[in-house]
């Protein structure tokens, strides 16, 4: 059986939309599937790599690599999107390409970044971990770390940094899929909202779905002990 909830929820474009949340009900009137997984049920994607989920994550990453920061022209906010999802008339799509990106580093002026920009994250304004020396962030936003400390400055002059961020990574469903969404939408969908991250590639949704002890390598499920827990 399915339980359907409909509600008006604030979405990425800053408008409220009617959203449906479909929950697979437990036939035996008990915990939901997500709760059962958290409690240690035999759920194979938590025990070993699942090809379907792996392909989903790779597809999400490929899309994210090509994303940019969509900044609303009315200063109402910004969100990481694909170019096609950013209004050409009501917003500005900040995406580095060709020669428009910043240099990889102050020591390497010739090589320009082509991957980015990312809403609220920039190698030039992140103090920790700083992009410098032997630790220059790669020209692939899906390999960027989470910035734990921003440079102390009210404004940077960068469109993608001085905007009010409207969406962050949200882990939705038992498949461990990730979407950049508003907090409201994420909570309504019973997802896990990552306040600390800017990109889906920075979070490991399956690790969150599985719960219990974190994977030794966040990319590789290793909870073999589930075979004995349940």
């Amino acid at each position: 059986a399915q339980h359907v909830t409909t509600q008006l929820v604030l979405r990425n474009k800053g408008v409220y939309e009617s959203v449906k949340y479909i929950q697979q009900e437990n036939f035996w009137i008990g915990p939901s599937s997500i709760d059962l997984i958290h409690l240690g049920a035999k759920f194979s994607p938590c025990i070993r790599k699942d090809q379907q989920i792996e392909q989903l994550v790779l597809r999400e990453r490929d899309l994210e690599r090509d994303s940019g920061c969509c900044v609303q022209n009315d200063h109402s906010g910004c969100i990481q999107t694909q170019r096609k999802d950013c209004s050409e008339t009501l917003a500005t799509f900040v995406k580095w390409q060709d020669d428009t990106g910043p240099p990889m580093d102050k020591s390497d002026l010739g090589q320009k970044r082509t991957s980015g920009a990312v809403c609220h994250q920039d190698p030039r304004t992140c103090e920790e971990p700083a992009s410098s020396g032997a630790h220059i962030w790669p020209d692939d936003i899906t390999k960027w770390p989470i910035c734990t400390e921003q440079a102390k400055s009210n404004r940077t002059g960068f469109l993608h940094m001085d905007c009010q961020i409207k969406g962050r990574p949200c882990c939705i469903s038992t498949k461990g899929s990730c979407e950049i969404t508003t907090r409201e939408y994420c909570e309504f969908m019973h997802g896990y909202f990552h306040e600390e991250a800017t990109l889906c590639s920075q979070v490991h949704c399956l690790d969150k779905v599985c719960g219990l002890l974190p994977f030794l390598n966040p990319e590789v499920p290793d909870q073999f002990y589930r075979l004995w827990l349940s």
Epitope: D99, T100, G101, P102, P103, K106, S107, L109, G110, K112, R124, T125, E127, A130, S132, A151, K152, R155, T156, G157, F158
Partner: antibody, heavy 123, light 106 residues
């Protein structure tokens, strides 16, 4: 208010070492992303970049003069120094220090300049 | 080494006139920076990233260009614009400036 003030010997003789000091106020060179550069200008001529130093102590020099230049900083005193060894009359110029900024820029630029200090090399 | 060549070396204009000065680079660069130096004063930044006006710079100033060819335009010259204008590149080390364009008033 951000200001930079250069100071130097005024006059020195060929083969001596020129020592310049840039005193910063209104900002700190220990702040992430900050940099300070030295630029000189012979009287009636154009600008020539000499060197710059960043908050993380990375230093960059004009290769044409690199063997003679040394840039350094004292974060506690909020000062930047430039030494030019073995000067000669061609080093006679006004020496400016300038703050490096990247506000809104994909690169960097010299956004605040000092008033400059005049140095004459003469025997 | 990227050499920047400014032209003309000297130009004169009447108040209210539109003037354009150019800066050519020996190699392709991504962005150009422009500085103004009034007689007896230190330089100040006018334009960064080719076309962005620095803080406090009047809107009569504008910059454009790409590749190896860049220009600075003053839409209506005023007496206070009498100065030498320098272009500068930050595309590769060493950082280089153009020799300058001196703007005089007729």
């Amino acid at each position: 208010q951000v200001t930079l003030k250069e100071s130097g010997p005024g006059i020195l003789q060929p083969s001596q070492t020129l020592s310049l000091t840039c005193s910063l106020s209104g900002f700190s060179l220990s702040t992430f992303g900050r940099g300070v550069g030295w630029i000189r200008q012979p009287s009636g001529k154009g600008l020539e970049w000499l060197a710059h130093i960043w908050w993380d102590d990375e230093k960059y020099y004009n290769p044409a003069l690199k063997s003679r230049l040394t840039i350094s900083k004292d974060t506690s005193k909020n000062q930047v120094f430039l030494r030019i060894a073995n000067v000669d009359t061609a080093d006679t110029a006004t020496y400016y220090c300038a703050r490096i900024q990247n506000y809104g820029s994909n690169y960097w630029y010299f956004d605040v300049w000092g008033t400059g200090t005049t140095v004459t090399v003469s025997s | 080494l990227i050499v920047l060549t400014q032209s003309p070396a000297i130009m004169s204009a009447s108040p209210g006139e539109k003037v354009t000065m150019t800066c050519g680079a020996t190699s392709r660069i991504s962005y150009m920076f422009w500085y103004q130096q009034k007689p007896g004063s230190s330089p100040r930044v006018l334009i960064y990233d080719t076309s962005n006006l620095a803080s406090g710079v009047p809107v009569r100033f504008s910059g454009s260009g790409s590749g190896t060819s860049y220009s600075l335009t003053i839409s209506r010259v005023e007496a206070e614009d009498v100065a030498t204008y320098y272009c500068q590149q930050w595309n590769s080390y060493p950082l280089t400036f153009g020799a300058g364009t001196k703007l005089e008033l007729k």
